[in-house]
């Protein structure tokens, strides 16, 4: 089959890094400077991606593979193949149209990217808050109040956790 195909289509023999040159009676020609073909049988070479501005070069272009970009410090990649760079924010913030804004009370963001997410509601799982949440960190849920009642376990229970706004009984 391969032999039949190559007899029918001489371009199928052109390896990566070359293109099938119609101007030269369909012989394989190496890709011109700053272009590439990553697969065989190509009729053109693709122009290399240039990592400019907020993009920086992670991998140089070659005749057989495109350049790869990432983002300069203070920015992070978005999209397939790092098609966009988005500004970083601090932990405890999210990026809005007006720039980086602190997370609202009851929400947190532990990364330099993404949006602020609500704290975990411990009570939905019948648990209590062991460590309060902050703008940068989610709450830490502890054992349920029932687990902490005397006689619930033969193991000595830990001291009850204080929930925010509660004074010790």
């Amino acid at each position: 089959f391969e032999r039949t195909r190559s007899l029918q289509d001489p371009c199928s023999n052109c390896p990566a890094g070359t293109f099938c040159d119609n101007n030269r009676n369909q012989i394989c020609s190496p890709c011109p400077p700053n272009s590439f073909s990553s697969a065989g049988g190509q009729r053109t070479c693709d122009i290399c991606r240039q990592c400019k501005g907020v993009f920086r070069t992670r991998k140089e272009c070659s005749s057989t593979s495109n350049a790869e970009c990432d983002c300069t410090p203070g920015f992070h990649c978005l999209g397939a193949g790092c098609s966009m760079c988005e500004q970083d924010c601090k932990q405890g913030q999210e990026l809005t149209k007006k720039g980086c804004k602190d997370c609202c009370f009851g929400t947190f963001n532990d990364q330099k990217r993404g949006i602020c997410r609500p704290w975990t509601n411990c009570s939905l799982d019948g648990k209590s808050v062991l460590v309060n949440g902050t703008k940068e960190r989610d709450v830490v849920c502890g054992p349920s109040p029932a687990d902490l009642s005397p006689g619930a376990s033969s193991v000595t229970p830990p001291a009850p956790a204080r929930e925010p706004g509660h004074s010790p009984q």
């Epitope: 890094g17 190496p30 890709c31 011109p32 400077p33 272009c61 070659s62 005749s63 057989t64």
Partner: nanobody, 111 residues
Framework: AVQLVESGGGLVQPGGSLRLSCAAS????????MSWYRQAPGKQRELVAW???????HYADSAKGRFTISRDNTKKTLYLQMNSLKLEDTAVYYC?????WGPGTQVTVSS
Amino acid sequence: AVQLVESGGGLVQPGGSLRLSCAASGNIFSIRVMSWYRQAPGKQRELVAWFAWDNIAHYADSAKGRFTISRDNTKKTLYLQMNSLKLEDTAVYYCNSGDSWGPGTQVTVSS
């Protein structure tokens, strides 16, 4: 324009070796891609070995492991070292850069 002239062809037995040379003159500073092609009687010209614009050597499947492309920029010369030659390597070998072609040098492998 760039002028190219090949040399080093000849008659050799199967399993033998030859070293082809391609001397370049003219505006060689614009050269980034240089290639060796060959054309056997009644067949289409085929790419054998080349230096890509990123300065990496590449080879057609038929040349891998047997042929080596190299160059000496001080002498403005491209080379093709051909080892373990086979009957099917018989062809006229051409040096190429862009639109410039040498006149070719005949390589005949025969017992």
